[in-house]
């Protein structure tokens, strides 16, 4: 009997408002035993996969997706999904990444703390389970 897979969570480090040219890392979390984490951008047509999974806690695994130098084009909605054989999970909530010009003023902090929900949430759909992990190479456009 197949287990019910918990929804993944998504967060961003150091936050969700990132100065142009700075780095950001998206962190996806799911249960132990995840084979592939996928970070989707705006829609399913643009994504990145990783199988570099590590422990986040005794009951959780995580994967990290790093953008070294954020551009304006990186702004948008991101969400996570994972493959734990033999099926895909539901998507996480959306997290919105905002990219701002570096002003450096005392009243404009460089980043805002990230959260697993993110400032923008949209309902996720559950129709991703027909996909298989892109273990032989990404089948869609790269995120970055």
């Amino acid at each position: 009997q197949e287990e019910d897979l918990p929804r993944p969570s998504i967060s961003a480090e150091p936050g969700t408002v990132i100065p142009l040219g700075s780095h950001v890392t998206f962190v996806c979390r799911g249960p132990v035993g995840v084979q592939t984490f996928r970070l989707e951008r705006d829609s399913r047509s643009t994504y990145n996969d990783t199988e570099d999974v590590s422990q986040a806690s005794p009951s959780e695994s995580e994967a990290r997706f790093r953008i070294d130098s954020v551009r304006e084009g990186n702004a948008g909605l991101y969400r996570c999904i994972y493959y734990k054989p033999p099926k895909w999970s539901e998507q996480s909530d959306y997290l919105e990444l905002l990219v701002k010009e570096s002003s450096g003023g005392p009243d404009s902090p460089d980043t805002e703390p990230g959260s697993s929900a993110g400032p923008t949430q949209r309902p996720s759909d559950n129709s991703h389970n027909e996909h298989a992990p892109a273990s032989q190479g990404l089948k869609a456009e790269h995120l970055y």
């Epitope: 890392t25 249960p31 132990v32 035993g33 084979q35 996969d49 990783t50 199988e51 570099d52 999974v53 590590s54 422990q55 806690s57 005794p58 009951s59 994967a63 990290r64 997706f65 790093r66 892109a134 273990s135 032989q136 190479g137 990404l138």
Partner: antibody
Framework: EVQLVESGGGLVKPGGSLRLSCAAS????????MNWVRQAPGKGLEWVAR??????????YYADSVKDRFTISRDDSKNTLYLQMNSLKTEDTAVYYC????????WGQGTLVTVSS | DIQMTQSPSSLSASVGDRVTITCLAS??????LAWYQQKPGKAPKLLIY???SLADGVPSRFSGSGSGTDFTLTISSLQPEDFATYYC?????????FGGGTKVEIK
């Protein structure tokens, strides 16, 4: 089909150096963490080293027994994993396996390293 | 470092027997545990990951259970090809330590 093929093993004197290679195929190498595991003759398995992906800044981890002597590295353009072994000791004699992470689901056939005078 | 204590170190069994091997972690590792089978002169083969998940192509007579510190590998009905050495390994934190192994021999 996933394949991991190790090479570079052989006979070396104590204090010497050796570089092992592992050619990977049949999977997307650059999105996987990779490991080296060794097994001394007639003994159990010992994890040696791990290297993560670009998303994790190619972070490396080592067993205490090899720290500061062995260096794990990867060349994603060549789908190849390496283990540079310096200051070799007789107790490093073992079969060395290249293993895909994080669940150690695919193993190479191993390459024998013999450290003896 | 997390120590993995595997028992028994060896056992004799007959074809058709139910075989149980246990692994004890020195601290809690959740379900970050794997089991491997190794035959002489061959590389280890993954049987179970995440304590209970069966790896691809592994017969259903193999099963894993446990969480926290106590884990079990069970072979429900031993087959001739199952005579081998079995290892557990914790994947919770580096160094990723293995148990000492259990050699399953023909009675």
């Amino acid at each position: 089909e996933v394949q991991l093929v190790e090479s570079g093993g052989g006979l070396v004197k104590p204090g010497g150096s050796l570089r092992l290679s592992c050619a990977a195929s049949g999977f997307t190498f650059n999105i996987n963490a990779m490991n080296w595991v060794r097994q001394a003759p007639g003994k159990g398995l010992e994890w040696v080293a791990r290297i993560r992906t670009k998303n994790n800044n190619f972070a490396t981890y080592y067993a205490d027994s090899v720290k500061d002597r062995f260096t794990i590295s990867r060349d994603d353009s060549k789908n190849t994993l390496y283990l540079q072994m310096n200051s070799l000791k007789t107790e490093d004699t073992a079969v060395y396996y290249c293993v895909r992470g994080p669940y150690f689901d695919y193993w190479g056939q191993g390459t024998l390293v013999t450290v003896s005078s | 470092d997390i120590q993995m204590t595997q028992s028994p170190s060896s056992l004799s069994a007959s074809v058709g027997d139910r075989v149980t091997i246990t692994c004890l972690a020195s601290q809690t590792i959740g379900t970050w545990l794997a089991w491997y089978q190794q035959k002489p002169g061959k590389a280890p083969k993954l049987l179970i990951y995440a304590a209970t998940s069966l790896a691809d192509g592994v017969p259903s007579r193999f099963s894993g259970s446990g969480s926290g510190t106590d884990f079990t590998l069970t072979i429900s009905s031993l087959q001739p090809e199952d005579f081998a050495t079995y290892y557990c390994q914790q994947l919770y934190s580096t160094p990723y330590t293995f148990g000492g192994g259990t050699k399953v021999e023909i009675k």
